[in-house]
């Protein structure tokens, strides 16, 4: 592949004109030992509206893994099983934090960045414009 | 608001002790700006599996304020608009990375923490557990 | 205490399947991915995949794309790898590997599983 | 798919001695890369991650440094049990991919 060399302009992190910055310990601590574990269930098979998950990485932000959801189906899975086109799974989206490495390729020095991601599916009634 | 006075052990940005610390620029940048206007949508009404949005607000987090899901139901909305205790709604949960003030109450200083939210229910079959 | 414990030695004719299993104990099997590496008779090592237990999302290497599948079974904390249309260059120990996504390294390992294909 | 090469392939050491093995990635990896130790019939074990953080329980006397690039381990007095198979690895882009290891014999 195509060699990319690390970036000259990486800040120096005593740069005190390096704009609004702050310093970020990345041992991440982790709030959810202890939470209710159906968080970690089969949602995504069980739902009237399923997904699958998709692993998408981006080497240059942090965390650079995210798993996004899509949708299996336009429509919803009824009782019998069949999907009901009168309903429609949608996509629950939801605004995150990532860090992107700013200039790229810097080990140390990051922007914050708000990125969309797909977290999983939900079966909605459909908006129904009528025609005059 | 409260004054929090700034912790007289907050670290300098030149310390190289600081544990796996990196710089990040607070500016945000926003890649959601041309993405589908359809997230901010009436979904949480629409759905099957209807949910509320709740202000969870932490000072020493940042962000700062974060939107937590709580299903409405405990069952979901059938094609009557009933609540159909045969299905469960069930809250989609993301773990998502925040700034945590650390030490407390220091401007610039920050650890990274995962944290588990609520972002919307979906509507699941419930498990049966056939009792021989 | 984390450990892998995965599946004992197979010996398999070209063209058939084999399916390694990993089981996990000493944490919470849904909260981290697995990858699977392997390593033929003293060569280096080459990733064929992963899976995440707690959503079911997986992501392969293009090399085995075709021929590799990963599940995992919440119930038992154990994850699977299949691969299909063994030849005799599949011959390896194939390892599972606990992966650390905001850290970025395989902390845990399998003792390894020996596929030997051979007619 | 990013290459890893390293090198040398094989090296011959006494008890002592210090040892360096370098890792050239085929493009920028930053510094998502981490250094395993295998033994023979054993899995690998992670000594270094992010290039130069040493994993929990790793003698200081292993060492790693480097990013973009360039990467290089260090043994700085070599033990009797230090006597393996090293390898490099990247974390930085799937498919995640291994130097061709480096085996370090007594000499």
């Known amino acids: 592949g195509i060699t990319i060399p690390r970036n000259p302009g990486c800040p120096n992190s005593e740069d005190k004109n390096f704009p609004r910055t702050v310093m970020v310990n990345l041992n991440i601590h982790n709030r959810n030992t202890n939470t209710n574990p159906k968080r970690s269930s089969d949602y995504y098979n069980r739902s009237t509206s399923p997904w699958n998950l998709h692993r998408n990485e981006d080497p240059e932000r942090y965390p650079s893994v995210i798993w996004e959801a899509k949708c299996r189906h336009l429509g919803c899975i009824n009782a019998d099983g069949n999907v009901d086109y009168h309903m429609n799974s949608v996509p629950i989206q939801q605004e995150i934090l990532v860090l992107r490495r700013e200039p790229p390729h810097c080990p140390n020095s990051f922007r914050l960045e708000k990125i969309l991601v797909s977290v999983g599916c939900t079966c909605v009634t459909p908006i129904v414009h009528h025609v005059a | 608001g409260i004054t929090i006075p700034r912790n007289p052990g907050c670290p300098n940005s030149e310390d190289k002790n600081f544990p796996r610390t990196v710089m990040v620029n607070l500016n945000i940048h926003n890649r959601n700006t041309n993405t589908n206007p359809k997230r901010s949508s009436d979904y949480y009404n629409r759905s099957t599996s209807p949910w509320n949005l709740h202000r969870n607000e932490d000072p020493e987090r940042y962000p700062s304020v974060i939107w937590e899901a709580k299903c409405r139901h405990l069952g979901c909305i059938n094609a009557d608009g009933n609540v159909d205790y045969h299905m469960n709604s069930v809250p989609i949960q993301q773990e998502i990375l925040v700034l945590r003030r650390e030490p407390p109450h220091c401007p610039n200083s920050f650890r990274l923490e995962k944290i588990l939210v609520s972002v919307g229910c979906t509507c699941v079959t419930p498990i049966v557990h056939h009792v021989a | 205490e984390v450990q892998l414990v995965q599946s004992g030695a197979e010996v398999k004719k070209p063209g058939a399947s084999v399916k390694v299993s990993c089981k996990a104990s000493g944490y919470t099997f849904t909260d981290y991915e697995f990858h699977w590496v392997r390593q033929a008779p003293g060569q280096g090592l080459e990733w064929i995949g992963v899976?995440?237990?707690?959503?079911?999302?997986?992501a392969y290497n293009q090399n085995f794309r075709d021929r590799a599948t990963l599940t995992a079974d919440k119930s038992t904390s154990t994850a699977y790898m299949e691969l299909s249309s063994l030849r005799s260059e599949d011959t390896a120990v194939y390892y599972c590997?606990?992966?650390?996504?905001?850290?970025?390294?395989?902390?845990?390992w399998g003792q390894g599983t020996l596929v030997t294909v051979s007619s | 798919d990013i290459q890893m090469t390293q090198s040398p392939s094989s090296l011959s050491a006494s008890v002592g001695d210090r040892v360096t093995i370098t890792c050239k990635a085929s493009q920028s990896v930053s510094i998502d890369v981490g250094w395993y130790q295998q033994k023979p019939g054993k899995a690998p074990k992670l000594l270094i991650y992010h290039a130069s953080n040493r994993y929990t329980g790793v003698p200081s006397r292993f060492s790693g440094s480097g990013s973009g690039t360039d990467f290089t381990f260090t043994i700085s007095s070599l033990q009797p049990e230090d006597f393996a198979t090293y390898y490099c690895q990247q974390d930085y882009s799937s498919p995640y991919t291994f130097g061709q290891g480096t085996k370090l014999e007594i000499k």
């Open positions: 899976i995440h237990p707690g959503n079911g999302g997986t």
């Open positions: 590997t606990r992966f650390l996504t905001y850290e970025g390294y395989f902390d845990y």
